[in-house]
């Protein structure tokens, strides 16, 4: 029961996270005009990964796409790539995890296959979350660098008379959405990996141990056949984990701790 809950929760958390990564990638407010210590302008500038926008006090908003690939900064291209990779991996992970869900029966799918699929989707979610966090962090670092550079030469002009006020940009809403979404996807992935451990079927979890009976050189595998030695007599409802016997319920209620990034 605990495995199903962990897997289901991991799926839902990852789903929310990937939806957030998609939303962040599409949002226009990756960087917004810094209004602090700036003359009050009647124009508000903000930029996304795909276009830049200007909102006038009149209420009119004009957005222009970046209709060039070669002319864009390499860092922006890198951020785009990271976010897209994150979305693609996340989407594939979601697809895989749907079939891996314990509550969904698809034909005669083996438990081992479900465990493998759960692990695969978990790893995909972790990488997806890391890609999003990395992409957003790279962009944030780029903003911080540009912010201080533009602050250093904010006022340019002749003879002290101010001619141009340079527009400075600060963190936009998309960055926070991206960080949170990346974190959720990462957590969801970790939960899926934890759930995978409890999903593994009996055969894959047995450890082959050689038992040497005195006077006989016969190797026994627990539960293989019922010998008078007493081994295997009640292994039917038990799984052997690292030499310790636990009931099926005990195995499923694996402890988990979730730290939010």
């Amino acid at each position: 029961m605990a495995v199903t809950a962990c897997q289901g929760l991991g799926f839902v958390v990852s789903l929310i996270g990937i939806a957030g990564i998609i939303a962040a990638t599409c949002m226009d407010q990756w960087s917004t005009q810094d209004l602090y210590n700036n003359p009050v302008t009647a124009v508000f500038n903000y930029q996304g990964l795909w276009r830049s926008c200007v909102r006038e006090s009149s209420g009119f908003t004009e957005c222009r796409g970046y209709f060039t690939l070669l002319g864009l900064p390499a860092m922006l291209q890198a951020v785009r790539a990271l976010m897209i990779v994150g979305i693609v991996l996340g989407a594939i992970g979601l697809l895989v995890s749907i079939f891996a869900l314990k509550c969904i029966r698809i034909g005669s799918m083996e438990d081992s296959a479900k465990a493998n699929m759960t692990l695969t989707s978990g790893i995909m979610f972790i990488v997806s979350g890391l890609c999003a966090i990395a992409g957003v962090s790279v962009f944030a670092n780029m903003l911080v660098t540009n912010f201080w550079m533009s602050t250093a030469n904010m006022y340019t002009g002749m003879g002290g008379m101010v001619q141009t006020v340079q527009t400075r940009y600060t963190f936009g809403a998309a960055l926070f959405v991206g960080w949170v979404a990346g974190g959720l996807t990462l957590i969801g992935g970790v939960m899926m990996c934890i759930a995978c451990r409890g999903l593994a079927p009996e055969e894959t979890n047995y450890k082959a141990v050689s038992y040497h009976a005195s006077g006989h050189s016969v190797a026994y595998k627990p539960g293989g056949f019922k010998a008078s030695t007493g081994f295997g007599s009640n292994t039917k409802n038990k799984k052997i984990y690292d030499g310790g016997a636990r009931t099926e319920d005990e195995v499923q209620s694996y402890p988990s701790k979730h730290d939010y990034v």
Epitope: T41, A42, E56, S57, S58, G59, F60, V165, T167
Partner: antibody
């Protein structure tokens, strides 16, 4: 067609208040910001402030902050400008105008002459 | 506040001749976000309300004759009437639409010589 029709001329005593109305027609009132500009006799144009009828957000020129109040009535498609503590230098033609691209004013009212005289 | 200075204060030009009005702002009106200059030109004929001629410094408002042209960037702007007509007699104002409070130039009176 798109037009802004202002209320009639007003004669007020110093210290009194005046409320000028500006009725919009021919367009969706809440989609455009309404600005107020005044022009003293023989003088240039002076921006007073604006109101966004959609959310009642307003901004004032420092000179009119606290003395001018911009409001709007969505149901009546009308914007109002109230100026209190009138002085002789407030005698002017008051215009309402609609905000357009580039924060420019594309449609203007005919103007309301406010005379301040004791 | 941004100071808008127009020159000359008044201008007398013969019919069919070119009229040029300059406008200088104390700060740049160029927005880096869209590379547009937030300067507007208005025409006010005697006894009438102002009329929009150009926004974004050079974008002509619909219905404005093409003998009118707007140019300039940053702090220096120009309104040109290529061939003055009798109906162009008016006061012309430039306006800062970038910084609050929006400020107007003192106006340039165009007359026929």
């Amino acid at each position: 067609q798109v037009q802004l029709v202002e209320s009639g001329a007003e004669v007020k005593k110093p210290g009194a208040s005046v409320k000028v109305s500006c009725k919009a027609s021919g367009y969706t009132f809440t989609s455009y910001v309404v600005h107020w500009v005044r022009q003293a006799p023989g003088q240039g144009l002076e921006w007073m402030g604006y109101i966004n009828p959609y959310n009642a957000d307003s901004k004032y020129s420092q000179e009119f902050q606290g003395r001018a109040t911009l409001t709007s009535d969505k149901s009546a498609s009308t914007a109002y400008m109230e100026l209190s503590s009138l002085r002789s230098e407030d005698m002017a033609v008051y215009y309402c105008s609609r905000s357009y691209y580039g924060n420019s004013f594309d449609v203007w009212g005919q103007g309301t002459l406010v005379t301040v005289s004791s | 506040d941004i100071v808008m200075t127009q020159s000359p204060d008044s201008l007398a030009v013969s019919l069919g001749e070119r009229a040029t009005i300059n406008c200088k702002s104390s700060q740049s009106l160029l927005n880096s976000g869209n590379q547009k200059n937030y300067l507007t030109w208005y025409q006010q004929k005697p006894g009438q309300s102002p009329k929009l001629l150009f926004f974004w410094a050079s974008t002509r408002q619909s219905g404005v004759p093409d003998r009118f042209s707007g140019s300039g960037s940053g702090t220096d702007f120009t309104l040109t009437i290529s061939s003055l007509q009798a109906e162009d007699v008016a006061v012309y104002y430039c306006q800062n639409d970038y910084y609050f409070p929006f400020t107007f130039g003192q106006g340039t009176k165009v007359e026929i010589k």
